[in-house]
Interface confidence: low
Amino acid sequence: KVEELARSLRMDIERVARENSDLQRQKLEAQQGLQASQEAKQKVEKEAQAREAKLQAECSRQTQLALEEKAVLRKERDNLAKELEEKKREAEQLRMELAIRNSALDTCIKAKSQPIIPVPRPMGPVPNPQTIDPASLEEFKRKILESQRPPAGIPVAPSSG
Amino acid sequence: KVEELARSLRMDIERVARENSDLQRQKLEAQQGLQASQEAKQKVEKEAQAREAKLQAECSRQTQLALEEKAVLRKERDNLAKELEEKKREAEQLRMELAIRNSALDTCIKAKSQPIIPVPRPMGPVPNPQTIDPASLEEFKRKILESQRPPAGIPVAPSSG
């Protein structure tokens, strides 16, 4: 009976010892898993930070690039606007100048039939000088303007003067 | 002696059982720690993805905005370039027109001293008509141009013709 009891107790001890060793192993596995998981978490955090930093840098680069391109375009636009203003002023001055010349030419052509400075009339008959008769005035006007036509093929804006 | 052995064995069993229960608790703690760590890792991943997506969206929005602003600037620049081209052509045409008028005016003034169309000379003496003498030509020229001066205060570009 005593031996039986001893055997039974020894079996209990062996069983509990086995459980003990199983638990020891399981505990170790769980601890290793925990450590691996924590390392993986740290790795994920690190990688995420790296990706975010890269994204941020790429975005900043794109933004910077866009800003520079915008600055170039803005400069080009402003220079063109300035140049256009100058050209507008130049065209305006040319139009005024043209109006003056047109008016002067008109005055000159009309003056053919009535010279501005009359010559004193002599008392008696004199030899006949070269004279201008009104009938030939239109012909004269046409010939002057014809002689000034630009070469064919160059379009000329109609005079605004 | 048997009782002593039994007592010793029982103490062993209790000790191992205590160890067992300790190990059980430690294993459970490690497993819970592992689960918590894995959940924390997933949370970190999810949050990182969210931040990345947000960064990406914000970057896309900025890029889109910059693209639109660039498109506006490019359009403005191109329109100004087009307008400038037109103004350059207009100024060129005005310059040509002015050159033509200047030449015509010169021809007209010169013609004062030598009419283009000669009038047949009569055989005998006739009453003296209005004549043009070369002496008065310069005075005539001066008066035409003076009469065409623009009002004060309007700047006029020097003629390029």
Epitope: Q62 | E47, A50, K54, S60
Partner: antibody
Framework: EVQLQQSGAEFVRSGASVKLSCTAS????????IHWVKQRPEQGLEWIGW????????EYAPKFQGKATMTADTSSNTAYLQFSSLTSEDTAVYYC??????WGQGTTLTVSS | DVVMTQTPLTLSVTIGQPASISCKSS???????????LNWLLQRPGQSPKRLIY???KLDSGVPDRFTGSGSGTDFTLKISRVEAEDLGVYYC?????????FGGGTKLEIK
Amino acid sequence: EVQLQQSGAEFVRSGASVKLSCTASGFNIKDYYIHWVKQRPEQGLEWIGWIDPENGDIEYAPKFQGKATMTADTSSNTAYLQFSSLTSEDTAVYYCLYQEGSWGQGTTLTVSS
Amino acid sequence: DVVMTQTPLTLSVTIGQPASISCKSSQSLLNSDGKTYLNWLLQRPGQSPKRLIYLVSKLDSGVPDRFTGSGSGTDFTLKISRVEAEDLGVYYCWQGTHFPFTFGGGTKLEIK
């Protein structure tokens, strides 16, 4: 689990104002853009705009500029959509959603004259 | 605004048969970051919309792989390889590339 819980149905008179709410659970609204969408009876969907609760950045569709006001309270994890001078045209179901794709169940707004 | 045109307006399909919905945009939806922000949604009767697909072809989690999205630029398609009873409802495409974001008019899928 990610959820967007919207406030209950509203019945209001023409000319009045109303404020709809959208409370998030399972995520932090400051980490995402929150969008609002309008759906009129038997009609399609119209995007109202988005808000970034983290910094208050807002983008409205031109049609809703001046009509709708989006706000957010990060402490209660809630986004809001407010309307003023309501008309019958504003009668619709309003949905909130976050950029990852989940939609709220919608709030029915009825404006009576 | 970018106009999203969906065809057909209504689609009557027998269970087990395939279905296809087209969505065309008035401007290219390719964003400067190289991504195309085109989503597909399904609104089942009496429910709020649910996103099925984002970035043209990426399936949302929990969406069966009988759904596929394709296309680029201005032309996009949603295909269902074998229609099931739970697929009935209104399908919408919507773009998130250009402000303001816009939706298609919807395609109603009916079961024959």
